[in-house]
Amino acid sequence: AFGISGVQKYTRALHDSSITGISPITEYLASLSTYNDQSITFALEDESYEIYVEDLKKDEKKDKVLLSYYESQHPSNESGDGVDGKMLMVTLSPTKDFWLHANNKEHSVELHKCEKPLPDQAFFVLHNMHSNCVSFECKTDPGVFIGVKDNHLALIKVDSSENLCTENILFKLSET
């Protein structure tokens, strides 16, 4: 109706949001799976990590990811310099010194080795979704979420709040 979606319009300034404090408010080691219960796995290939979305064989151990939670100010959409409450951001690390990164140019999700402080591309707004699912919105590209495409993780643009419930951007977190 306004030529720009609610998600895009409201979150266009997410990259301006300030993360409160350098250290995370808490950390959580969990396995990550899709809405359809496929596992997200990480494999070392040619000295770099690849990310896969696959069905695990029975009794096959799930890969774990360390989620680090950060409290962040949410920027106001009115003036652009105000604050409209708080939100939770996460970084995701499947192994020491490697973090999931949003590659907005390639619309891909990659594992990069890096030192702290982590770049903005490693931060994702965590959304609490229905059916015990979450979704991950890019800090650097509001309205763009981690999703599943062709058995890989990819960046998927969500053009309206109605599409926030699209199954391919919904994930489950589990301690087992």
């Epitope: 609610g6 998600v7 319009k9 939770l88 965590l126 709040s161 109605e162 977190l173």
Partner: antibody, heavy 119, light 111 residues
Framework: EVQLVESGGGLVQPGGSLRLSCAAS????????MSWVRQAPGKGLEWVAT????????DYVDSVKGRFTISRDNSKNTLYLQMNSLRAEDTAVYYC????????????WGQGTLVTVSS | EIVLTQSPATLSLSPGERATLSCRAS??????????LNWFQQKPGQPPRLLIF???NRGSGIPARFSGSGSGTDFTLTISSLEPEDFAVYYC?????????FGQGTKVEIK
């Protein structure tokens, strides 16, 4: 400035109906989950219903299921609560609330509108 | 449903004193590694105001004298030094699962 303004409260007889409205401003309405929370006179807070930003999901407390309907019109930045088959125990101040961005907690509250169910 | 029990029901203190409010859940409110327990302040004739989210994080514009702690089922709201404007009713609330539930409230009154 983020604002929520409720309206539509009043006196209604048991078995009657009422529709509450909540006009939102200062934020992109469709990006946020919205809820109704009520408070009976001199009592504590009770969550009533929630609707997701895209209208896909709704949830209700058991005591109002089948009687109350939460809805929203994102083009009008307005949240509604249709209340049917009202009972004396529904008498309360009804607050409109907005979740934070990401939908983890009730962050913004309106001033409330009083609903009185009495004969 | 998750039942939240607050204690004490009333706390009578003087300005400058430390207030400690308790909230106990009937089951864990942990989800995704977060303690989804929030605290609200309500003054007469006013709507509730978010003080603390996810057990220990202050809402926007909330003074540092307010702090939250706890995990699992036991949580505490502490006001380090009461100001005159802090005398109010305080509610804990869980956002782990539907139905979202509130504690019955603790009234902090002037002694």
């Amino acid at each position: 400035e983020v604002q929520l303004v409720e309206s539509g409260g009043g006196l209604v007889q048991p078995g009657g109906s009422l529709r509450l409205s909540c006009a939102a401003s200062g934020f992109t309405f469709s990006s946020f989950s919205m809820s109704w929370v009520r408070q009976a006179p001199g009592k504590g807070l009770e969550w009533v219903a929630t609707i997701s930003g895209g209208k896909t999901f709704t949830d209700y407390v058991d005591s109002v299921k089948g009687r109350f309907t939460i809805s929203r019109d994102n083009s009008k930045n307005t949240l509604y609560l249709q209340m049917n088959s009202l009972r004396a125990e529904d008498t309360a101040v009804y607050y409109c609330t907005r979740a934070n961005y990401g939908n983890w907690f009730f962050e913004v509250w309106g001033q409330g509108t009083l609903v009185t169910v009495s004969s | 449903e998750i039942v939240l029990t607050q204690s004490p029901a009333t706390l009578s203190l003087s300005p400058g004193e430390r207030a400690t409010l308790s909230c106990r859940a009937s089951e864990s409110v942990a989800k995704y590694g977060l303690s989804l327990l929030n605290w609200f302040q309500q003054k007469p004739g006013q709507p509730p105001r978010l003080l603390i989210f996810a057990a220990s994080n202050r809402g926007s514009g909330i003074p540092a004298r307010f702090s939250g702690s706890g995990s699992g089922t036991d949580f505490t709201l502490t006001i380090s030094s009461l100001e005159p404007e802090d005398f109010a009713v305080y509610y804990c609330q869980q956002s782990k699962e539907v139905p979202f539930t509130f504690g019955q409230g603790t009234k902090v009154e002037i002694k």
